[in-house]
């Protein structure tokens, strides 16, 4: 079965919280959740960027038409490619807490297909041909999800909907507690 | 400019210890994870501690591990790097790197500053 | 032993495009993200590409990562002079309690 481009255009989907992995709600700290008694400036989303498009998980709209052999279907179809990046922007002190953001390299997430939908279209033929009936499948939405170090880049662990969001307005665990204290913890946040 | 010096580099004898330190500036210290990585003489890149912004965002290389002490002060906007019980084997170039981006690379260096062990 | 394996040296005329290869294991490239960095003779190193196949500012587009599986690579186009230095690609490794770990470093000579 072919494809043939007729138009498209792009949805940018800034991943939420919820889709990025997260270690245990006491690898969090106060300083992740309230800047203001750490100099007072605001808190940033964990993924802020200047450039948006440079980290996020786009979602490409392409309108096309379904053919098979000489045939082609009435009316086209739009169905999305997953593109971009998945990942933070920037290393900012209130993104502790998504993760061990403070390394030069960790767990690679790929922009992939999250859901599908059938759709039945009809196709004409030439040569007064009866029109044939197929059903394709179609990428729904994108979403980011995790290489995980066992499988290949085509398996991918979903971290999607299962991550617990994170807990506002904890009160501050003291700052004295060492390396070895959280290394339980730290093992673990993956 | 954004800019890392170390210091506290020399020579030491095989047991002692050394403290390095890097200071920063032309940028906002406390947005980087800062790490340390050396050069042995002729020898590619070596890992050897990152740190975040509290005492338990803190990694070590196996090499260094109960050793060497990664620290910093945002205040001073200084890192440092305690060295007890050195050995030949880490002479090299220390330098100072820092992270602005999650997962993102080292994007800021020092120049280092040398180290030798030896008796 | 580097636990990423790079090729020593690589050459290339001015010109070319020269592709330096970066080998590693499920527990760092597999999973994590590949950096690679540039150091020019008697210098500090350079990022010069991040999350796989990321530029930072400032790097030019003759420069482009790739990663597959458990291995990635550094593609150069339109090699010039200023190229020659040492290559290094760096990954997490989340082995025992994790580090960073970098290749062996590839020697890149423009003839």
């Known amino acids: 079965q072919g494809w043939q481009a007729f138009k498209n255009d792009a949805t940018e989907i800034i991943p939420e919280l919820g889709e990025y992995p997260e270690p245990p709600p006491e690898l969090e700290n106060n300083k992740t959740m309230n800047r203001a008694e750490n100099g007072g400036r605001p808190p940033h989303h964990p993924f802020e960027t200047k450039d948006v498009s440079e980290y996020s998980c786009r979602e490409l709209h392409f309108t096309r038409y379904v053919t098979d052999g000489p045939c082609r279907s009435a009316k086209p179809v739009t169905e999305l490619v997953c593109s971009g990046q998945c990942g933070p922007a920037r290393l900012l002190p209130n993104a502790i807490g998504r993760g061990k953001w403070w390394r030069p390299s960790g767990p690679d997430f790929r922009c992939i297909p999250d859901r599908y939908r059938a759709q039945r279209v009809q196709l004409l033929c030439p040569g007064g041909e009866a029109p044939r009936a197929r059903k394709v499948r179609l990428v729904a939405s994108c979403k980011c999800k995790r290489l995980t170090r066992f499988h290949n880049q085509s398996e991918l662990k979903d971290f999607g909907t299962e991550a617990a969001r994170p807990q506002k307005g904890r009160k501050p665990r003291p700052r004295a507690r060492s390396a070895k204290a959280n290394q339980a913890e730290l093992e673990n946040a993956y | 400019e954004v800019q890392l010096v170390e210091s506290g580099g020399g020579l030491v004898q095989p047991g002692r210890s050394l403290r390095l330190s890097c200071a920063a500036s032309g940028f906002t210290f406390d947005d980087y994870a800062l790490h340390w990585v050396r050069q042995a003489p002729g020898k590619g890149l070596e890992w050897v501690s990152g740190?975040?912004?509290?005492?338990?965002?803190?990694d070590y290389a196996d090499s260094v591990k109960g050793r060497f002490t990664i620290s910093r002060d945002n205040a001073k906007n200084s890192l440092y790097l305690q060295m007890n019980s050195l050995r030949v084997e880490d002479t090299a170039l220390y330098y100072c790197?820092?992270?602005?981006?999650?997962?993102?690379?080292?994007?800021?260096w020092g120049q280092g500053t040398t180290v030798t062990v030896s008796s | 032993q580097s636990v990423l394996t790079q090729p020593p040296s690589a050459s290339g005329t001015p010109g070319q495009r020269v592709t330096i290869s970066c080998s590693g294991s499920?527990?760092?490239?597999?999973?994590?993200?590949v950096n690679w960095y540039q150091q020019l003779p008697g210098t500090a190193p350079k990022l010069l590409i991040y999350s796989n196949n990321q530029r930072p500012s400032g790097v030019p587009d003759r420069f482009s990562g790739s990663k597959s599986g458990t291995s990635a690579s550094l593609a150069i186009s339109g090699l010039q002079s200023e190229d020659e230095a040492d290559y290094y690609c760096a990954a997490w490794d989340d082995s025992l309690e994790g580090s960073y770990v970098f290749g062996g470093g590839t020697k890149l000579t423009v003839l």
């Open positions: 790197a820092g992270n602005s981006r999650g997962y993102g690379g080292l994007d800021v």
């Open positions: 740190i975040g912004w509290e005492d338990d965002m803190i």
């Open positions: 499920s527990s760092n490239i597999g999973g994590n993200t």
